[in-house]
Interface confidence: low
């Protein structure tokens, strides 16, 4: 068991690399990446290392959340001597080695990003040959995902007293603001929840009591786009319908 | 070689604030997060929170949030532990101790003994 | 939080033979990754503790072989295949697979 050092590198500015008369173990990753939701991302992670000439077995690996106990989204290896790191899992098949970590270089692709990806990630490297060592980024890389506003819920429900209630709710990075129009309202903001905690993409607002039939519409909006839906209340009709 | 050095007792009065210290050597202080441990006499231990001396970060256990305040010196090489509002119920030996490759405690302090009395 | 739970005594044992100290968590620490998060501790009589074995299975520098621990996600036994004079403590087990990370209430081992 090699007692190994752990990286508190923040970002590339402050990382402490001796090149003599021997590495250490470091990582430099920087502090954030940010892409927009159905696009691809590449998280940049290169290390140093104490064992000059290993060209064992190793492992590359990086996982979601938290250091060491987070889960894994991908992992390769490769056979001593190889310079291909045969993918041994792939996280929904999104996830593909970037660099060739013979030469240092952990950096992943995530393909296809949803606001879901929008979490911190730790690269790992294990050495397992004759010298048996590994390490991995501490502090990590926050993957940052933009997406334009997608409403993902708006209905009608029965309050008390004969009454109904509308609620709306978005997701979006930034959290979009939303608004409510419809009879009687003018543009009204109602009451916005935001964000729901669990939930940091989505915004829900609500609009109390709907004193007049007809058509409400919802729009969310933020730095990347505008996304509108509507709901259309017949009080009299003895029913509620969404439209969206 | 790796040493985490505290001082053996103090001895503080009921509703002072003590301040306890934790002196790190032989390693880089930066790249180790450092924990607080917590034993009553004669009682099992009670994780109390960690800092990470790099960027001064603190997580706390909720049952110590507004008791223990976790802090660093970087140039001395040091971690702190404030505590406040002293009751005899925080009469206890205090560890610090480093955080190790996985984040277990692989290095330990000798403790202190908080003593709090009139 | 995660419960750990021990028993606050071992049965005595003579030394040379063997001993066995169990643990018990109230969730799984086996992680999806692989790893369990489960520690052993020694705190030896007037001294801090110091760290005995690491993600369940792996032994801490410096410990002898004489240790050993295995386990499924919620139970977890330590394992002294000759114990020593020197053995003589308190066995705290330990998990770090959440925040706040937690201790068993230890478990002494008496001699006979």
């Known amino acids: 068991f090699v007692r190994t050092k752990i990286d508190t590198t923040e970002n590339l500015l402050n990382t402490e690399v001796h090149s003599s008369p021997a590495q250490r173990w470091s990582m430099q990753v920087p502090p954030e990446v940010s892409a927009e939701a159905g696009d691809a991302a590449v998280l940049p992670c290169t290390f140093t290392h104490p064992h000059r000439h290993y060209d064992g077995p190793l492992t590359a690996i990086w996982r979601a959340g938290e250091p060491y106990a987070g889960p894994q989204v991908f992992r390769c290896a490769a056979a001593r001597g190889s310079e291909l790191c045969q993918t041994a899992l792939s996280l929904h098949g999104r996830f593909r080695l970037l660099g060739n970590p013979r030469r240092n270089d952990l950096s992943l692709r995530v393909e296809r990003l949803a606001l879901a990806d929008d979490r911190r990630y730790f690269c790992r490297v294990e050495f397992a040959g004759d010298v048996h060592d590994r390490y991995e980024s501490r502090h990590g890389v926050r993957l940052h995902v933009t997406a334009a506003p997608r409403i993902v819920n708006i209905s009608v429900l029965p309050s008390p007293a004969h009454a109904f209630r509308a609620l709306c709710t978005a997701e979006g990075e930034p959290p979009p603001a939303l608004a409510w129009s419809g009879p009687a309202l003018g543009n009204s903001l109602a009451a916005v929840r935001s964000p729901r905690e669990g939930h940091g993409h989505l915004v829900t607002a609500e609009l109390p009591a709907l004193t007049h039939d007809g058509r409400y519409t919802c729009t969310a909006a933020n730095s990347l786009g505008r996304s509108e839906a509507s709901v259309y209340l017949f009080r009299f009709h003895g029913a509620s319908g969404a439209s969206t | 070689q790796v040493q985490v050095q505290q001082p053996g007792a103090e001895l503080v009065k009921p509703g002072a604030s003590v301040k306890l210290s934790c002196k790190a050597s032989?390693?880089?202080?930066?790249?180790?997060?450092m924990h607080w441990v917590k034993q009553r006499p004669g009682q099992g231990l009670e994780w109390i929170g960690l800092?990470?001396?790099?960027?001064?970060?603190?997580n706390y256990n909720e049952k110590f949030n507004t008791k223990a305040t976790l802090t660093v010196d970087k140039s001395s090489s040091t971690a702190y532990m404030q505590l406040s509002s002293l009751t005899s119920e925080d009469s206890a030996v205090y560890y610090c101790?480093?955080?190790?490759?996985?984040?277990?405690?692989?290095?330990w302090g000798q403790g202190t003994t908080l003593t709090v009395s009139s | 939080d995660i419960v750990m739970t021990q028993a606050a005594f071992s049965n005595p044992v003579t030394l040379g033979t063997s001993a066995s100290i169990s643990c018990r968590s109230s969730?799984?620490?086996?992680?999806?990754?692989?790893?369990?998060?489960l520690y052993w501790y020694l705190q030896k009589p007037g001294q801090s503790p110091q760290l005995l074995i690491y993600?369940?299975?792996n032994l801490a520098s410096g410990v002898p072989d004489r240790f050993s621990s295995s386990g499924s996600g919620t139970d977890f036994t330590l394992r002294i295949s000759r114990v020593e004079a020197e053995d003589v403590g308190v066995y705290y087990c330990?998990?770090?697979?959440?925040?706040?990370?937690?201790f068993g209430g230890g478990t002494k081992l008496e001699i006979k």
């Open positions: 101790a480093r955080g190790g490759d996985g984040d277990y405690f692989d290095y």
């Open positions: 800092i990470n001396p790099s960027n001064a970060r603190t």
């Open positions: 993600q369940m299975s």
């Open positions: 330990a998990q770090n697979l959440e925040l706040p990370y937690t």
């Open positions: 969730k799984s620490l086996l992680h999806s990754n692989g790893i369990t998060y």
């Open positions: 032989g390693y880089t202080f930066t790249s180790y997060w």
